[in-house]
Interface confidence: low
């Protein structure tokens, strides 16, 4: 009863020309030990012969004969539990289905594993949190659906083309559940990082470039403001006029409201980027700043100290 065969392995394995593929695999045949194992490439069932046709990459029969010339293909398993395979190096034309033809005393089974070999190293994939806010620590993740014992790789993080100083943690998985290499970087972005390009670069053991993925940082932040005053020294006499201008150097998302504050108190009906004070009086001396808000929160400019002297 072929329903007794239970296999566990990654569904699809990914590699590129010249690299290798390590296929973690376990199986169970309840009626006893394996007597014959054949690894096919793209097997097809032949109804006339009741056998499978296809390239035989590896063959192991009960009398121990291993006629395979494919030294690059290794069966690292055993007769009752392990069906792990290694192909090193792996070639473009290895893409397709690997068929594990297993036979025990009374049962037969064909297990299929998909192999996807690309011509060049495929890029990793950067995963960002759904939202990034300034000064809040986030974890950047770079994931590559590849890991192989015979082909060491590394993932490096770059910001605007320059290696990032923060320490990244790299982990690999070579299990029946999943095969991947992952790099995680904890990072506290500043507002000035908004719009900057982050790269995760795949390199070989010698640091040679293989591929990369890039993302543009979208750092949510309160409006960043500059205040300008005329006259520039903010010292005037009673009766003079003063103009203060608020400039938004950056805001993400877009700003929604503008207000002016004097000594921390909002000035009524002053909701434009220019504050005009005409014929100032002594009691208008004080600390002025502009406040611009967006969905993240309010941003304030530096304070300007206005000194109104007697005429």
């Amino acid at each position: 009863d072929s329903s007794k065969w239970v296999f566990e392995h990654p569904e699809t394995l990914y590699a590129w020309e010249g690299a290798c593929v390590w296929i973690p695999c376990t199986y169970r045949a309840l009626d006893g030990d394996l007597e014959s194992f054949i690894l096919f490439h793209n097997p097809e069932y032949n109804k006339n012969t009741s056998k499978f046709d296809g390239t035989r990459l590896y063959e192991s029969t009960k009398d121990g004969k291993v006629p395979s010339e494919q030294k690059r293909v290794q069966f690292l398993g055993d007769k009752n539990k392990n069906c792990t395979l290694s192909i090193h190096p792996v070639h473009l034309n290895d893409s397709g289905q690997l068929g594990l033809r297993m036979e025990s005393k009374t049962e037969k089974w064909m297990e299929r594993i998909h192999l996807n070999v690309s011509e060049r190293p495929f890029p990793p994939h950067i995963q960002l949190p759904p939202e990034i806010q300034e000064s809040q620590e986030v974890t950047l993740t770079c994931l590559l659906n590849f890991s192989c014992y015979g082909y060491p790789i590394q993932l490096q993080w770059l910001l605007e083309g320059v290696p990032m100083r923060q320490a990244a943690v790299t982990s690999t998985s070579l299990t029946i559940k999943s095969v991947f290499t992952r790099s995680e970087l904890k990072f506290s972005p500043q507002w000035s990082h908004h719009g900057k390009i982050v790269t995760c670069q795949l390199q070989d053991a010698d640091g040679k470039f293989l591929s990369n993925d890039t993302v543009q940082l979208n750092v949510k932040h309160t409006p960043k403001l500059e205040i300008k005053v005329t006259p520039s020294d903010a010292i005037v006499r009673e009766g003079d006029s003063v103009t203060m201008t608020c400039e938004v150097s950056s805001s993400n998302p877009e700003y929604t409201t503008v207000s002016w504050l004097k000594d921390g108190t909002s000035l009524k009906k002053q909701n434009t980027f220019t504050l005009n004070l005409r014929e100032v009086t002594k009691d208008q001396s004080g600390k002025y700043c502009c406040q611009v808000s967006n969905d993240v929160g309010p941003g304030r400019s530096e304070e300007v100290f206005l000194q109104v002297q007697y005429a």
Epitope: F7, P43, Y45, Q97, H114, I176, S178
Partner: antibody, heavy 120, light 112 residues
């Protein structure tokens, strides 16, 4: 264009047998799992079983094992559902559905369905 | 067998409404490969079902972007962001991770 066309439905007496056919065209028949799904009148969908035509490998839902048999003929690009010892509760529309990818498992193409009525 | 329970069984909604259908499995439907083979199908009266979403959240080709899927483990959701006249139908979740494969009982989306 990928197409599945079922046939063989009709009226059958309780205890009788019926063989449904699902003719496939527009793709490599032997390399995709073919599923049978049924739907009793006014009820939901129920998975019956599947076959991989390339090697004849099958899986069934437990309640259909023994009475229903799925087979395939790659020379005719046709899958079959042989139903024996039919009961009134087997009255349903029977659909064949292709697994679009042996690696993603989803039913991307369905036949139009064929109605089986079990009644005396 | 894994039971797939959908809620609600039926709902009435208007064109433009946001509709959410949930599907709960009686046990985890994570496949040994690490994938979760959870699909959503749409069926109209007298017609064969049509695939909308596969592997929890992947939209099948040609399916409008107003359909989205989410979830993990045992809890899954199909969302229609803005219901259109052609969306009134019955929706089924389906697990293809463990044998026997099983469908939910269906959710009928009717015009209010």
């Amino acid at each position: 264009e990928v197409q599945l066309v079922e046939s063989g439905g009709g009226l059958v007496q309780p205890g009788g047998s019926l063989r449904l056919s699902c003719a496939a065209s527009g793709y490599e028949f032997s390399r995709s799992w073919m599923n049978w799904v049924r739907q009793a009148p006014g009820k939901g969908l129920e998975w019956v079983g599947r076959i991989y035509p390339g090697d004849g490998d099958t899986n069934y839902s437990g309640k259909f094992k023994g009475r229903f048999t799925i087979s395939a003929d790659t020379s005719k690009n046709t899958a079959y559902l042989q139903m024996n010892s039919l009961r009134a509760e087997d009255t349903a529309v029977y659909y064949c559905a292709r697994d679009g990818s042996s690696w993603d498992w989803y039913f991307d193409v369905w036949g139009q369905g064929t109605l089986v009525t079990v009644s005396s | 067998d894994i039971q797939m329970t959908q809620s609600p069984s039926s709902l009435s909604a208007s064109v433009g409404d946001r509709v959410t259908i949930t599907c709960r499995s009686s046990q985890s439907i994570v496949h040994s490969s690490g994938n979760t083979f959870l699909e959503w199908y749409q069926q109209k009266p007298g017609k064969a079902p049509k695939l909308l979403i596969y592997k929890v959240s992947n939209r099948f080709s040609g399916v409008p972007s107003r359909f989205s899927g989410s979830g993990s483990g045992t809890d899954f959701t199909l969302t229609i962001s803005s219901l259109q006249p052609e969306d009134f139908a019955t929706y089924y979740c389906f697990q293809g991770s463990q044998f026997p494969y099983t469908f939910g009982q269906g959710t009928k989306v009717e015009i209010k």
